[in-house]
């Protein structure tokens, strides 16, 4: 399978909410012993391999933001920890996987990575990620709502297997 990033750039005004999205593409193993570990984290642009460095999002680590569920299931982070930080990650039946960030500040600007790991009995079989940039703006040049910029077809299926 692959991870697509429908939008490579999100430009939002301060105080707005934004939902960053990744999508699982291609054949997905639906065996009874297969689950999917999905999470989000921040990274930096200047790396040899995008998304290899893992930084917290609003002090929450990739472990705190993870979902771990079966292939047929929808899921979302229900624990108070994420919601207290204005964050919620979610996954639906159609392969869409997102993180919602509420009340954006300039400090939220940066590179965000989604990670999907196919797990078979607690062991990783396949690992892919996608990257996108969030720019939070303030002042007269800031848009009134979030503006999203589609990925190029090459970027939208950007995949790195570990």
């Amino acid at each position: 399978f692959k991870v697509a990033t429908p939008y490579s750039l999100y430009v939002c005004p301060e105080g707005q909410n934004v939902t960053l999205t990744c999508r699982l593409l291609g054949p997905v193993d639906k065996g009874h012993d297969v689950t999917f570990y999905k999470t989000w984290y921040r990274s930096s642009r200047g790396e040899v391999q995008t998304c290899s460095e893992r930084r917290p999002i609003r002090n929450l680590t990739f472990q705190d933001l993870h979902l771990h569920h079966g292939g047929h299931q929808a899921a979302n982070t229900s624990h108070d920890l994420a919601q207290r930080h204005g964050l919620e990650s979610a996954s639906d039946h159609h392969g869409n996987f997102s993180i919602t960030m509420r009340n954006l500040t300039l400090l939220d600007s940066g590179l965000y990575c989604c990670l999907v790991v196919e797990i078979r009995h607690h062991h990783s079989e396949h690992r892919v990620h996608g990257a996108m940039e969030l720019q939070v703006q303030t002042g007269k040049d800031a848009p009134s709502n979030c503006v999203v910029y589609p990925s190029s077809s090459q970027d939208s299926e950007n995949i790195t297997a570990a």
Partner: antibody, heavy 122, light 112 residues
């Protein structure tokens, strides 16, 4: 400090049922897979059940499949083992153990509780 | 099921000596993802097992560097370079590569 405290062990007759609990503290319980491991009177260790962090996946060896059910309540930070149709060979000390992982990829059973004793005898 | 066989059953040592425990699996425990999920645990008298080594040779946090793990495929070894009194107990190897996960029968490290 990671703490796992098992309870619910007892003397039970063959064919009976028992529910074990494992109260977890000192870590974010919902981030980790968990297992139950038992130690028989001859000191052999046997893994009896495992569950992933979200509770969507469980596994049992043939020796307990269909008789034991592992579950978890992430809000209560508690792991459970429901045991039914108990046999004398289920007599053991039962330990809960945390699965040390990264991205859901298993590394080891890094922390164990002190155990709760189950005796199946008529 | 993968059978894990430990030798010796009992290992009498003098304090300060080197100790070596062998663990052999009935089939390769290299997982399809390339990792070998072989661990070593120590159970001291009256206590629960404690993790020493994971993925063949990685020491768990707080484990002294006198403990080392090695091996590949089906043959694995735990070495204790200089045995101390606190090292006494039963050592178990464990494979987490293939379900069901299985333990070795244990090796009792005791004073000679």
């Amino acid at each position: 400090e990671v703490q796992l405290v098992e309870s619910g062990g007892d003397l039970v007759k063959p064919g009976g049922s028992l529910k074990l609990s494992c109260a977890a503290s000192g870590f974010t319980f919902s981030n980790y897979g968990m297992s139950w491991v038992r130690q028989t009177p001859d000191k052999r260790l046997e893994y009896v059940a495992t569950i992933n962090s979200g509770g969507s996946y469980t596994y049992y060896p043939d020796s307990v499949k269909g008789r034991f059910t592992i579950s978890r309540d992430n809000a209560k930070t508690t792991l459970y083992l429901q045991m039914s149709s108990l046999k004398s060979e289920d007599t053991a000390m039962y330990y809960c153990a945390r699965i040390y992982d990264y991205d859901g990829d298993y590394y080891a059973l890094d922390y164990w509780g002190q155990g709760t004793s189950v005796t199946v005898s008529s | 099921d993968v059978l894990m066989t430990q030798t010796p059953l009992s290992l009498p040592v003098s304090l300060g000596d080197q100790a070596s425990i062998s663990c052999r699996s009935s089939q390769s425990i290299v997982h399809t993802n390339g990792n070998t999920y072989l661990e070593w645990y120590l159970q001291k008298p009256g206590q629960s097992p404690k993790l020493l080594i994971y993925k063949v040779s990685n020491r768990f946090s707080g484990v002294p560097d006198r403990f080392s793990g090695s091996g590949s495929g089906t043959d694995f070894t735990l070495k204790i370079s200089r045995v101390e009194a606190e090292d006494l107990g039963v050592y178990y190897c464990f494979q987490g590569s293939h379900v069901p996960w299985t333990f070795g029968g244990g090796t009792k490290l005791e004073i000679k």
